[in-house]
C-alpha cells in the first residue's frame, strides 16, 4: 500500500499487499480490511462497503494481538494452591501462574504457566546451596570446601566457615563445625596459635537433588530413596 493512510476496507493496488500488522486480506470481499485490536474479536467480517465489526472479549476470554479471530481465547484456569498469579486474566492477556516460594518450575508450558511446581531440592549435611541455580530454577548443591561445613538438610543453607579456635578440641569436617577446647587460665600468658580445622573428604552426592537440563552436569535426583534418575527437566 502506498505511504499515505488508507481507510479500510480498500482494494489493494496491483503489486501491493495489505498492512499485515493491523489489516488482513478478505478473500470473499477481495479487500484489505481492519483486524480487531487486542481485547476484541471479529463480530462481523467486512464486505466491499463496510469494514470489520469488532466486539469486546467476554469475561475470562482474551486476545493478545491484532486479530481476525471469530472468538476470543479462553484464559488459563485459575492458579492452583502451589502457585501464585503473576499476571491476571484480562481482555488483552492470559493469566500466568508461577510457582510459590520454595518451589521451582519443573515443566513450563508455552502459555507461560507452570504445569509442575516442585519443592526445591534440599542439600544434605556436607553440602551447601550453590550460588547459581539449575536452568529450571531448582537448587544446586555443592560439596562444602575445606574449612567450611553444613550440618543441615536445607534448600537455603550455604556452607559456613568452621569456627576459629585458640585451642582446637575436635577438627571440623564438611558436615560438622570445629569444637574448641576451653582455654586454661594458666595458659593465658602463652602466645596463642589459631587453629582452622580442615575437613575430612566429603561424599560426592547431594541429597534430594532435582535436575537441570541434560546439557548441564547431571545432579542426582531422589525423594528420600535410592535415586534412579539423574533428572533433566525443561519446558517447551
Amino acid at each position: 500500500v502506498p505511504a499515505q493512510v488508507v481507510l479500510t476496507p480498500y482494494k489493494p493496488e496491483p503489486g501491493y499487499e495489505c498492512q499485515i500488522s493491523q489489516e488482513y486480506y478478505d478473500r470473499k470481499a477481495q479487500m484489505c480490511c481492519a483486524k480487531c485490536p487486542p481485547g476484541q474479536y471479529v463480530k462481523h467480517f467486512c464486505n466491499k462497503t463496510s469494514d470489520t465489526v469488532c466486539a469486546d472479549c467476554e469475561a475470562s476470554m482474551y486476545t493478545q494481538v491484532w486479530n481476525q479471530f471469530r472468538t476470543c481465547l479462553s484464559c488459563s484456569s485459575s492458579c492452583t494452591t502451589d502457585q501464585v498469579e503473576i499476571r491476571a486474566c484480562t481482555k488483552q492477556q492470559n493469566r500466568v501462574c508461577a510457582c510459590e516460594a520454595g518451589r521451582y518450575c519443573a515443566l513450563k508450558t508455552h502459555s507461560g504457566s507452570c504445569r509442575q511446581c516442585m519443592r526445591l531440592s534440599k542439600c544434605g549435611p556436607g553440602f551447601g546451596v550453590a550460588s547459581s541455580r539449575a536452568p529450571n530454577g531448582n537448587v544446586l548443591c555443592k560439596a562444602c570446601a575445606p574449612g567450611t561445613f553444613s550440618d543441615t538438610t536445607s534448600s537455603t543453607d550455604v556452607c559456613r566457615p568452621h569456627r576459629i579456635c585458640s585451642i582446637l578440641a575436635i577438627p571440623g569436617n564438611a558436615s560438622t563445625d570445629a569444637v574448641c577446647a576451653p582455654e586454661s587460665p594458666t595458659l593465658s600468658a602463652i602466645p596463642r596459635t589459631l587453629y582452622v580445622s580442615q575437613p575430612e573428604p566429603t561424599r560426592s552426592q547431594p541429597l534430594d537433588q532435582e535436575p537441570g537440563p541434560s546439557q548441564t552436569p547431571s545432579i542426582l535426583t531422589s525423594l528420600g530413596s535410592t535415586p534412579i534418575i539423574e533428572q533433566s527437566t525443561k519446558g517447551g
Epitope: T80, T81, D82, Q83, A106, L107, T109, H110, S111, R115, Q116, C117, M118, R119, N136, N138, D208, E210, P211, P213, S214, T221, S222, L223, G224, S225, I228, I229, Q231, S232, T233, K234, G235, G236
Partner: antibody, heavy 118, light 112 residues
Framework: EVQLLESGGGLVQPGGSLRLSCAAS????????MTWVRQAPGKGLEWVSD????????YYADSVKGRFTISRDNSKNTLYLQMNSLRAEDTAVYYC???????????WGQGTLVTVSS | QSVLTQPPSASGTPGQRVTISCTGS?????????VHWYQQLPGTAPKLLIY???QRPSGVPDRFSGSKSGTSASLAISGLRSEDEADYYC???????????FGGGTKLTVLG
Amino acid sequence: EVQLLESGGGLVQPGGSLRLSCAASGFTFSDAWMTWVRQAPGKGLEWVSDLSDSGGSTYYADSVKGRFTISRDNSKNTLYLQMNSLRAEDTAVYYCGRLAAGGPVDYWGQGTLVTVSS
Amino acid sequence: QSVLTQPPSASGTPGQRVTISCTGSSSNIGAGYDVHWYQQLPGTAPKLLIYSNNQRPSGVPDRFSGSKSGTSASLAISGLRSEDEADYYCSVWDDSLNSWVFGGGTKLTVLG
C-alpha cells in the same frame, strides 16, 4: 526400596463407582508428585491424572474429567483415585506412579484391574 | 489413534541394533518438550527406560539410548538380547491437548 502397591480394582457395573488406593513406601511421599496411568486390555498406555505433592494441583485427561477425582493422604502415604459414572471404556489396568521433575514416571506400581461390565 | 506415532512392531536377531521411532508434532516433541521412553516386559508394569530424550536411569544398560530431532524421537537398542523382547512406549507433554501423551507402543521381537 521404592514400592507402590495398588488395590481396590474389581468388577463394577456401568454407572457404578470404585475407589482405587496406592500405598507408597521407600521414599518421602509428601515430597512426590504422583500419577495414575491406565492400560486397556491389549492396548497402549493412557495418562489419567496427576497430583502435586501437597495435593494443591490436580490435572485430568479429558476422557475422565468430571468423573474421576485424584487425592492423597500424606499422613498415610496413600494416593487415591475415586472413579464415578464408570463406562465400559474405563476397563483397564490402572497403574499408580511417582512423577519425577519434568514428567517421567520413575517408579510404577504393579497395577490393579478395573472391569466395567454389566 | 495416538498423538505420537510408533511402528506397531520391530524385530531383530540377538546382537543386532534396532531403532524404534516416535513421531509427534509441533505441539509436543517439536515444541521442545522432553521425550521419555518406557519398557513393558510381558505381564509386568512399565519401567522408565530413557528420560529427557537421552538420559538413562541408573540400572539401565548403556545398550539403550535415546535421541530427538525436530518432531521425532527414537530409541536405539544395540547388542539386542532375548530379554529385550517387550513393548516400548514413548511419552511427551502436549501443549494443545494440555496433557501427557503416549505413543501407541512398539512390540519388539527378538528372533532366533
